[in-house]
Amino acid sequence: RLSPEYYDLARAHLRDEEKSCPCLAQEGPQGDLLTKTQELGRDYRTCLTIVQKLKKMVDKPTQRSVSNAATRVCATGASRWADVCANFMRRYQSRVTQGLVAGETAQQICEDLRLCIPSTGPL
């Protein structure tokens, strides 16, 4: 649960200035599609893929609708992808859900997770 202690710890790690990441990816006009595919961190690319899938799965993002979609988002694709996806969702589901509910773009959500450090590992 999101306890007061969690907030205190998290606040301690937040800088006062706006958080930003040096990501190179750009989204299309709808905020949905990755239009440039530079060398991105594996987790960042995973994040973008999952968030974009979730956006397509829900008509309107609410805590309930995104949470329901989150239980199905990893079910499609190869088993290796399913494992990567499930691992990502275990760590970040609540934050991804909150970002989607608030109307953040996929890029904003994934940058806010600080996942955009380039990585040479495969997806």
């Epitope: 649960r1 999101l2 969690y6 907030y7 998290a10 606040r11 937040l14 006062d16 706006e18 905020g31 309107k60 609410t62 805590q63 309930r64 609708s65 949470s67 989150a70 589901q93 609540s94 934050r95 859900t97 909150q98 970002g99 608030a102 109307g103 953040e104 773009t105 904003q108 806010d112």
Partner: antibody
Framework: EVQLQQSAAELARPGASVKMSCKAS????????MHWVKQRPGQGLEWIGF????????DYNQKFKDRTTLTADKSSSTAYIQLTSLTSEDSAVYYC????????????????WGQGTSVTVSS | DIVLTQSPASLAVSLGQRATISCRAS??????????MHWYQQKPGQPPKLLIY???NLESGVPARFSGSGSRTDFTLTIDPVEADDAATYYC?????????FGGGTKLEIK
């Protein structure tokens, strides 16, 4: 100190429009969505909708969608609500309230409210 | 829409006694392990003030006399012991589903 300063009371004719403002200070404007809540005299609270200043995303209560427009100006940390085709049913106090985009920014609820703007619709 | 029904609509409690306010949702307001239910206090001529968020978390600066409990559809705000300054109207509010909704309010009078 967090403050949400709302514009002065409005007196309007039926059929007219009003635009109210909510100027935020004391926090990072883009980390919070701005919500609007209506309260008719002696009545309860009704959620109108919210705007995300980061992305421009808006989410409206269907009941208010047709005659309400929410906007925000990041440069001045100000949110606006415009009501059109006013009727006597729109006579109420309108509150703005902030809500964190992510739960590590603060309590995941509307934690600070403006003082309210009173709108009176009368011929 | 999720309908929030508060009871009682009003109550009078003696100074130093316990006040209990109930909020029942027409459907569950729980998602991914959290109950998206919050409690606010409103005094005449003032905006609402956040007391409890996510069903049971006490907002900073709010006295520990206030507590919240519950999950899914049944929630409770408890004030123990009640003080004179607690005379106000209390609202529950959910944001699990659109549109966000408030309960009808409970007016607390101190005897």
């Amino acid at each position: 100190e967090v403050q949400l300063q709302q514009s002065a009371a409005e007196l309007a004719r039926p059929g007219a429009s009003v635009k109210m403002s909510c100027k935020a200070s004391g926090y990072t404007f883009s980390r919070y969505t701005m919500h609007w809540v209506k309260q008719r005299p002696g009545q309860g609270l009704e959620w109108i909708g919210f705007i995300n200043p980061n992305s421009g995303y808006t989410d409206y209560n269907q009941k208010f969608k047709d005659r309400t427009t929410l906007t925000a100006d990041k440069s001045s940390s100000t949110a606006y609500i415009q009501l059109t085709s006013l009727t006597s049913e729109d006579s109420a106090v309108y509150y703005c309230a902030r809500h964190p985009i992510y739960s590590d920014y603060g309590p995941y609820a509307m934690d600070y409210w403006g003082q309210g703007t009173s709108v009176t619709v009368s011929s | 829409d999720i309908v929030l029904t508060q009871s009682p609509a009003s109550l009078a409690v003696s100074l130093g006694q316990r006040a209990t306010i109930s909020c029942r949702a027409s459907e569950s307001v729980d998602s991914y392990g959290n109950s998206f239910m919050h409690w606010y206090q409103q005094k005449p001529g003032q905006p609402p003030k956040l007391l409890i968020y996510l069903a049971s978390n006490l907002e900073s600066g709010v006295p520990a006399r206030f507590s919240g409990s519950g999950s899914r559809t049944d929630f409770t705000l408890t004030i123990d012991p009640v003080e004179a300054d607690d005379a106000a109207t209390y609202y529950c509010q959910q944001n699990n589903e659109d549109p966000w909704t408030f309960g009808g309010g409970t007016k607390l009078e101190i005897k």
